[in-house]
């Protein structure tokens, strides 16, 4: 009967997945640079924050050279994963002092999403460990005040902009390895 | 287009062994994920094994672990399942297929019976 | 027993709109993985019909549409048609496999 017939190609590949996931974290870095600014203009932040339930920064300018692709993509859906869960909390429970922001945190949060959705895809595709490694979920309480949520608020965006950062950096890097 | 082709089924006693090859073309093999999935007759699908796209990640169906190699061969384009200790339960359509998975060979079926 | 749980037959008259389920657990559909659909002719090969819970290959009919929440996925097939009669397979990726999970298929019938 002949060879059998070959399947049409789907929407993407692995590769097409990546430049995705850094055109998706460019964007993403773009909304939170600016609604950082924004924070900034309406509650001007009064030194550094930070909240300990954040992932800390997973990597640094040193160990870009070192990346290697399944460490990368588990650690950055890990940490996206985390602050897509902060920013549902802001939202939920950032007060009446955030409300004014709501239609960028509701922006932001359905990027991330979208962002998460991509980079589940491009491991699939590539067949990766995809179950984050086992870490503490530290629950997150009501802000104490209307000044905790702002606060926390400077400490996710700050965070996520920090985050997202070295992810556009350590995804170019890795394109160059797939 | 894409093309997987399975090969090497037939039949074999319980307790035998056989070594499944599956040769694409059509896509760029090395950045792909591949499995082995299977299908008892008249059954559903069941999943086998996967190796990562340079097949430094393995894993197995309990049904299948410490039986069955999955491994990979990226200057060839070929995907191999060895199978050993075969039983009756083990017979069904074997099926290579590659990423999500997105495609999907026709098949080759291994038949487990004295 | 598959660990994604589908109705093991459906059925519609052509032009009609049919739904299959798919319910997992916390482990797979329930942490947060995508599902994908696949439709199986009659003696055929399986081929990708949804993935990423919404998204479809080139060449899929905008007919077919996928949705998740929760633990559980569904697939809508909307103006059946006598072509549609294949079996329906959900999938999603298993933490404790460390590889994709099936559903134990639908068998859809065209009256």
């Known amino acids: 009967p002949g060879p059998p017939a070959g399947s049409p190609r789907v929407s993407s590949d692995p590769r097409a997945d990546l430049d995705s996931a850094v055109l998706l974290t460019r964007s993403l870095l773009a909304d939170t640079r600016q609604l950082a600014a924004q924070m900034r203009d309406k509650f001007p932040a009064d030194g550094d924050h930070s909240l300990d339930s954040l992932p800390t920064l997973a990597m640094s300018a040193g160990t870009l050279g070192s990346l290697q692709l399944p460490g990368v993509l588990t650690r950055l859906r890990v940490d996206l994963m985390s602050y897509l869960r902060h920013v549902q909390w802001l939202r939920r429970a950032g007060g009446p002092s955030l409300k004014t922001l709501e239609p960028e945190l509701g922006a932001l949060q359905a990027r991330l999403e979208r962002l998460l959705r991509r980079l589940q895809l491009l491991m699939s595709r590539l067949a990766l460990p995809q179950a984050a490694p086992d870490q503490p979920v530290i629950p997150l309480g009501p802000p104490a005040s209307a000044w905790g949520s702002i606060r926390a608020a400077h400490a996710i965006l700050g965070g996520l902009h920090l985050t997202l950062d070295w992810a556009v950096r350590g995804l170019l890097l890795l394109k160059t390895r797939l | 287009e894409v093309q997987l082709l399975e090969s090497g089924g037939g039949l074999v006693q319980p307790g035998g062994s056989l070594r499944l090859s599956c040769a694409a073309s059509g896509f760029t093999f090395s950045s792909y994920g591949m499995h082995w999935v299977r299908q008892a007759p008249g059954k559903g699908l069941e999943w086998v094994s996967v190796i990562s796209y340079d097949g430094s990640y393995k894993y197995y169906a309990d049904s299948v672990k410490g039986r069955f190699t999955i491994s990979r061969d990226n200057s060839k384009n070929t995907l191999y399942l060895q199978m050993n200790s075969l039983r009756a339960e083990d017979t069904a359509v074997y099926y290579c297929?590659?990423?999500?998975?997105?495609?999907w060979g026709q098949g080759t079926l291994v038949t487990v019976s004295s | 027993q598959s660990v994604l749980t589908q109705p093991p037959s459906a059925s519609g008259t052509p032009g009609q709109r049919v739904t299959i389920s798919c319910t997992g657990s916390?482990?797979?559909?329930?942490?947060?993985?995508?599902v994908n659909w696949y439709q199986q002719l009659p003696g055929t090969a399986p081929k990708l019909l949804i993935y990423s819970n919404n998204e479809r290959p080139s060449g899929v009919p905008d007919r077919f549409s996928g949705s998740k929440s929760g633990t559980s996925a569904s697939l809508a097939i909307s103006g059946l048609r006598s072509e549609d009669e294949a079996d329906y397979y959900c999938?999603?990726?298993?933490?404790?496999?460390?590889?994709?999970?099936f559903g134990g298929g639908t068998k859809l019938t065209v009256l």
């Open positions: 297929a590659a990423g999500v998975p997105d495609y």
């Open positions: 916390s482990s797979n559909i329930g942490a947060g993985y995508d």
């Open positions: 999938a999603a990726w298993d933490d404790s496999l460390n590889g994709p999970v």
